[in-house]
Interface confidence: low
């Protein structure tokens, strides 16, 4: 489901599929 994160933004159920670098372990950059 949807979750509210600590910054007050609503995160979709598939948010963790968004590969990015800064803190995403699923990303390929580090």
């Amino acid at each position: 489901g949807w979750t509210l994160n600590s910054a007050g933004y609503l995160l979709g159920p598939h948010a963790v599929g968004n590969h990015r670098s800064f803190s995403d372990k699923n990303g390929l950059t580090s």
């Epitope: 979750t3 994160n5 600590s6 933004y9 670098s21 800064f22 803190s23 372990k25 950059t29």
Partner: antibody
Amino acid sequence: EVQLVQSGAEVKKPGATVKISCKVSGFNIEDYYMHWVQQAPGKGLEWMGRIDPENGNTIYDPKFQGRVTITADTSTNTAYLDLSSLRSEDTAVYYCARGYVDWGQGTLVTVSS
Amino acid sequence: DVVMTQSPLSLPVTLGQPASISCRSSQSIVHSDGDTYLEWYQQRPGQSPMSLIYKVSNRFSGVPDRFSGSGSGTDFTLKITRVEAEDVGVYYCFQGSHVPYTFGGGTKVEIK
């Protein structure tokens, strides 16, 4: 609800070491990289390094290498930042962060004799 | 290290008007995997930073669509179509393609 709760403000003398904790709830830290970012008073953001809590692998900005150690305890879902040989220019707010917009509230470290 | 240079340093804007922030990298931040890990962060006064944009142009869930990111290679832009009072703060670009990861110096958005 996702929360990253950092330990309280610290006042340290030059040459000392400070250890800051970042207690996480709402997700397992081993599923994400955990990063630390420095912000000196009135200044911008500086990336310090990150850890993969699953295996303890770390990478650091060479600027901080040797004085910074990032660790994580998956049993308590907590990340830590150790900064040693403190000097006045280390006076700053330190943030822990993970992906998808989540940052801790920041910990002010003041280095003063 | 990759140096991220933002301009302007300060951006006074009128409510309801557009705003644009530039970020240039000292070298290409296209990663070897083909992606460009350029991100934008907002820091409201007295608050922790918040993520707005990842991979140049992708908005995080919940980020208003008045924010948009664009660019490629070494030249990137954050645009706010109509500035609202809650948009006041400092905006940082960030590259996560090359270690050490680096932030731009920040652009302070204020209301005229």
